[in-house]
Amino acid sequence: FGDEEERRCDPIRISMCQNLGYNVTKMPNLVGHELQTDAELQLTTFTPLIQYGCSSQLQFFLCSVYVPMCTEKINIPIGPCGGMCLSVKRRCEPVLKEFGFAWPESLNCSKFPPQNDHNHMCMEGPGDEEVPLPHKTPIQPGEE
């Protein structure tokens, strides 16, 4: 790895994906963006859902798709595990439907490895919160 080749991993420059437990990525991401600026633009459209608070894992999950983890040790980006995807989807899909939208095809959970192992590396993410969802209405002015 001491060769003068192109650096394999790049620092994450997307503010909402910093301080999530890993700090480097490599584009293209898992939905095909070549640039972090383009990934950030798409990520921002999920802000209402993140603010709604349907899943504490949502932000980590989205970041793992749009800026997957990179390590100098292996040549492929490490995205989310299918289990985390399903957990987030279970909690957030009903909220998306309230907004009038379906779960995005780009976040289809079958695209991701079911679990992290030597053959298919993926991120399990922070622990899932198995508590009842509080009843929330779509975000009103002034709500944080």
């Epitope: 095909g32 383009d38 009103q140 709500e143």
Partner: antibody, heavy 118, light 110 residues
Framework: EVQLVESGGGLVQPGGSLRLSCAAS????????MHWVRQAPGKGLEWVAS????????YYADSVKGRFTISADTSKNTAYLQMNSLRAEDTAVYYC???????????WGQGTLVTVSS | DIQMTQSPSSLSASVGDRVTITCRAS??????VAWYQQKPGKAPKLLIY???SLYSGVPSRFSGSRSGTDFTLTISSLQPEDFATYYC????????????FGQGTKVEIK
């Protein structure tokens, strides 16, 4: 209920200025892209400008860059379009719209007519 | 800049007809394309987003599809309330932020 209400349209002379307002209710504009889209009489839709106040992003169509300014007052939950150096070709109905997931503009206001004429 | 060329500009059809409207992107784009319906004096209404996803509350006779740089809106069986103007819209994906609409297709009664 989500609602967008535009105001501020009217008759203005070429070279003049006008400020349009888009009052939003039922959601927090901070977390959504807010857009201005216009439609000249008998013509199609033309995107004018967008703002994402949560991150302070603003974007403009080339045809209005340097003349129009989009802004938002999140405490009033209102988006604005300041239009300067108006031209006859800016005559149109101006719509305010919001978008989030997949960029789709899911809610639109009723529109406000801007007429630039001497 | 990406251009969205919409065709036809107008068409005449009867109730019950199958209607197809196409938008061609001038270069490769993502599936971030939406379709809107607009009636005279009214604001546009969202029908389809992400090229093929039906927006909530929109009748299932409306559908969207993609083939390469061609995006298609299909109305499987035209209803009286469907006579209107339809617009495609390309959303930002890469290479900067620029929203472009197609020129519109007016669907009239034959």
């Amino acid at each position: 209920e989500v609602q967008l209400v535009e105001s501020g349209g009217g008759l203005v002379q070429p070279g003049g200025s006008l400020r349009l307002s888009c009052a939003a209710s039922g959601f927090n504009i901070s977390y959504y892209y807010m857009h201005w889209v216009r439609q000249a009489p008998g013509k199609g839709l033309e995107w004018v400008a967008s703002i994402y106040s949560y991150y302070g992003y603003t974007y403009y169509a080339d045809s209005v860059k340097g003349r129009f300014t989009i802004s938002a007052d999140t405490s009033k939950n209102t988006a604005y379009l300041q239009m300067n150096s108006l031209r006859a070709e800016d005559t149109a109905v101006y719509y305010c719209a919001r978008s989030s997931f997949s960029w789709a503009m899911d809610y639109w206001g009723q529109g406000t007519l801007v007429t630039v004429s001497s | 800049d990406i251009q969205m060329t919409q065709s036809p500009s107008s068409l005449s059809a009867s109730v019950g007809d199958r209607v197809t409207i196409t938008c061609r992107a001038s270069q490769s784009v993502s599936s971030a394309v939406a379709w809107y319906q607009q009636k005279p004096g009214k604001a546009p209404k969202l029908l389809i987003y992400s090229a093929s996803s039906l927006y909530s509350g929109v009748p299932s006779r409306f559908s969207g599809s993609r083939s390469g740089t061609d995006f298609t809106l299909t109305i499987s069986s035209l209803q009286p309330e469907d006579f209107a103007t339809y617009y495609c819209q390309q959303h930002p994906w890469s290479g900067g932020y620029l929203i472009t609409f197609g020129q519109g297709t007016k669907v009239e009664i034959k």
